[in-house]
């Protein structure tokens, strides 16, 4: 659109059509040039009495801001745009007002108005800006940090989306996004956003905000992924029933509605465009999520975005296929679905669909988490993830939720893409009317992902009441289990099962209080032998103060459901036997290790007898295979090379999160029992 | 600016060979995963042959393996499909894509498969 006064006066033209669509991180010219007539510019403008002065705004429905004025040959820019706009050909080309924006991001849509003064005239061009597409973080169903180069792109083009560039998510960053876990970039780099700089995401930038990187990474390597979704013609819509749908039945009433089941990235652009839907429903990659634009506390926690429900309470995993959401559909042509042959596979093979069950709830509820960094305990690992070295980021691991207690219950939990800076990069709802606690004590980092369970040898309570049919305390340890495959899995059933199938026994209440009087803490919750959870606290700290505030102590959620699913508290009292460790060069699968006891008259040790055998003495520094296919090793003898400051059983996990058993292919030590 | 353009279509007897060409700029082809799509006149889209950023990786659709090869020049910015043994039932448009959304596609170069 052009002004001016009155013809044969000064006239300022922008040669595009408006509006103008660009994509989110690039760059953009907006051509602007101004005819004189009254006063043709010949020579350079500085010696003319009266140059022309050129400012550049943009205006929003908000406000009109001045991002640079220009007379004389001298630019003067908005300090805020410093390096962002500039005039490419000015003052070499005086009548040229052409203006360069770099790395665009959706903040800088709007209006552009490029007006021209000289003298008492004045003329004006607009053009509209439109900057499209949106930036968000992808995980693959089953766990955080899954996806190799190949895969993180898979992952996109299977949520309408690509992947994103360097600069795309730098200017997602400088629109507010922030999220504390890494992921590819369309460069082969491994980068995540960083606003407020926390430990365990400081990576390469200490406590200075920006965008984290890793630099090129091995194509092999597995990380998250950062997506980019540019735009889309149809439409996202909710379609909801009093009894909602199945997986399968949201599929079907898309298709019923002439649609298809929406996928992530045509979500995020809904959600880009307004969409607020305080409802969850099933995608077509089988997560469930619902957008949130206007914040309100028993929404999504107050914050806005795409918010995600997840199976797990540290933000892995998504919903039984089974159970009853909305149908979130899209309706437009103008995506057309990649089979899933043509990523040579014939579906996600990396993906475990865990069931649990909980109860009925009306979603999305307010429970507030905040996820922690990796700062609960001491880490090796299995599998590398990355180069660790001091400032290799361990992106929110574990999750660490702040307690309300009396809240209400709810199975959502949180999302990445927000569209503001938070104090802690993700908040969602939790999935227990109570903190749930983080991952136990804090110890030096390290590089594997081991748990230090700080174990201890149990003493009776004066005064406990005896336990029929159990073992009493005396020389006995109680240790914290939980199965490989994720963190909070165990009903109660399962729960007595996984001690048993340990060499051990489910704890009781007051072994439990024994051992922490002992000095025997977990943040961890667990199943006992009288139906209550609980864990024991001697250091309090805020994702772990329970039902005790600040107070050292047993904290209890008294007795639970026993559908509901937690860790356990086991038992054992003394060996009946020996444990021993046996090593050769090649080590051992998984399959070999049970051959190998077994060739020599014994059996794989179960967990329950490594922690007697640690309890009676025995410490080694090398992880070996146990019955249930997890990798422990005892440490008698804290060194700072051997699992860190204090004795205990440490527990080697394939992920950063403490869950998931070594692949049974890998090669360790054994330890048999006899 | 994304530029996706197609080349090397044209009319071919059955049993004959093309090799279509795909220029692409404006984004980082290396570490982009490629495709090559084809749409038959009042039919939908066909997904043909799909390529990974490192040119490790190929799939094609059943109707089509053996007589396509899917490349690509990473240092040329070009995707390629060889076609071998071409059918009349070949005869589409073909267009090379990044992505499934078909706003990003190139215009698309017809092959015409007929005696």
């Known amino acids: 659109e052009e002004t001016s006064d009155h013809d044969n006066s000064l006239s300022v033209s922008i040669p595009e059509p408006s509006p103008m669509r660009v994509l989110l991180g690039s760059s953009l010219t907006i051509p602007c040039y101004f005819i004189d007539p009254m006063h043709p510019v010949t020579t350079a403008p500085s010696t003319a009495p009266l140059a022309p002065r050129i400012k550049w705004s943009r205006i929003t429905k908000e406000k009109e801001v001045v991002l640079l004025v220009a007379t004389e040959g001298q630019v003067r820019i908005n300090s805020a745009y410093q390096d962002k706009v500039s005039l490419p050909n000015y003052p070499a080309i005086p009548s040229d007002a052409t203006l360069e924006i770099q790395n665009l991001r959706s903040n800088d849509s709007g209006i552009y108005r490029c007006e021209v003064m000289h003298g008492i005239e004045d003329s004006e061009a607009t053009l509209e800006v439109v900057v499209k597409g949106i930036v968000f973080h992808y995980r693959a169903i089953s766990t955080r940090y899954t996806l190799d180069f190949d895969r993180a792109q898979r992952a996109c083009l299977q949520n309408s989306a690509i992947i994103a560039t360097p600069e795309q998510l730098q200017a997602a960053y400088e629109d507010g996004f922030h999220q504390c876990d890494a992921g590819w970039l369309a460069d082969q780099t491994v980068r995540y956003p960083i606003h407020t700089p926390r430990e365990g995401c400081y990576g390469d930038k200490d406590e200075f905000p920006g965008v984290r990187t890793y630099g090129i990474r091995d194509t092999n390597e597995t990380y998250d992924v950062y997506c980019f979704a540019e735009e889309m013609e149809g439409e996202v819509l909710y379609a909801t029933s009093p009894e909602k749908f199945t997986f399968q039945e949201a599929a079907n009433e898309c298709r019923r509605l002439g649609a298809r089941l929406a996928t992530t990235g045509q979500l995020y652009l809904a959600w880009q465009g307004g969409m607020d839907m305080c409802s969850a429903g099933w995608l077509a990659d089988r997560s469930v999520r619902y957008p949130i634009s206007k914040a309100r506390p028993n929404c999504g926690g107050n914050l806005l975005g795409v918010r995600t429900v997840y199976l797990h309470a540290n933000q892995t995993g998504y919903p039984d296929p089974s159970s009853r959401y909305d149908a979130i559909c899209y309706t437009g042509e103008d995506f057309v679905d990649i089979p899933e042959n043509f990523f040579g596979v014939g579906g996600e093979e990396d993906i475990t669909i865990q069931t649990v069950t909980w109860p009925d709830v009306e979603l999305p509820l307010p429970r507030n988490i905040t996820e922690g960094e990796a700062r609960g305990n001491v880490i090796l690992t299995v599998k590398p993830i990355f180069d660790l070295s001091p400032t290799a980021p361990e992106p929110e691991e574990p999750f660490t939720f702040v307690p309300e207690p009396e809240k209400p219950f709810t199975f959502a939990t949180d999302v990445g893409v927000t569209a503001f800076p938070e104090a802690e990069n993700r908040t969602g709802e939790a999935t227990r009317p109570w903190g749930v606690p983080e991952e136990s004590t804090p110890g030096p980092a390290f590089t594997a992902f081991t748990s230090e369970d700080h174990v201890v040898q149990v003493t009776a309570v004066p005064g406990a009441a005896e336990v029929p049919g159990q073992p009493r305390l005396p020389g006995g340890v109680v240790f914290h289990y939980r199965p490989g495959s994720a963190r909070y899995s165990l009903t109660f059933e399962e729960a007595q099962q996984a001690c048993l199938r340990t060499g051990a026994v489910i704890a009781s209440p007051e072994q439990l209080q024994a051992a922490y009087e002992a000095g025997y803490e977990q943040c961890d919750a667990g199943w006992l032998q009288d139906q209550t959870v609980r864990y024991p606290i001697v250091s309090p700290r805020t994702p772990c103060v329970g039902d005790k505030d600040s107070s050292p102590g047993v904290r209890t959620y008294g007795v639970r459901p026993p559908s509901e699913t937690y860790d356990v508290y086991c038992y054992v009292d003394k060996l009946e036997g020996e444990v021993f460790f046996i090593t050769r060069l090649e080590q051992f699968t998984f399959q070999e290790a049970l051959a190998f006891c077994e060739s020599h008259n014994a059996t794989l040790a179960s967990t329950g007898q490594l922690y007697a055998a640690w309890r009676q003495g025995l410490d080694k520094c090398y992880a070996g295979w146990l019955s249930d296919g997890s990798l422990r090793y005892p440490i008698v003898t804290p060194r700072p090379s051997c699992g860190g400051d204090k004795p205990g059983v440490r527990t080697v996990y394939l992920y950063p999160n403490q869950t998931g058993l070594p692949d049974p292919l890998s090669r360790h030590h054994v330890f048999c029992f006899r | 600016e994304v530029q996706l353009v197609e080349s090397g279509g044209g009319l071919v007897q059955p049993g004959g060979s093309l090799r279509l060409s795909c220029s692409a700029s404006?984004?980082?082809?290396?570490?982009?995963?490629m495709f090559w799509v084809r749409q038959a006149p009042g039919k939908d889209y066909e997904w043909v042959a799909s390529?990974?950023?490192?040119?490790?990786?190929?799939y094609y659709d059943d109707s089509v393996k053996g007589r396509f090869t899917i490349s690509r020049d990473s240092a040329k910015n070009t995707l390629y499909l060889e076609m071998n043994n071409l059918k009349p039932e070949d005869t589409a448009l073909y267009f090379c894509?990044?992505?499934?959304?078909?706003?990003?596609w190139g215009q698309g170069t017809q092959v015409t498969v007929s005696s």
């Open positions: 404006g984004f980082t082809f290396s570490g982009s995963w």
């Open positions: 390529i990974n950023s490192s040119g490790g990786r190929t």
């Open positions: 894509a990044r992505s499934p959304r078909v706003g990003s």
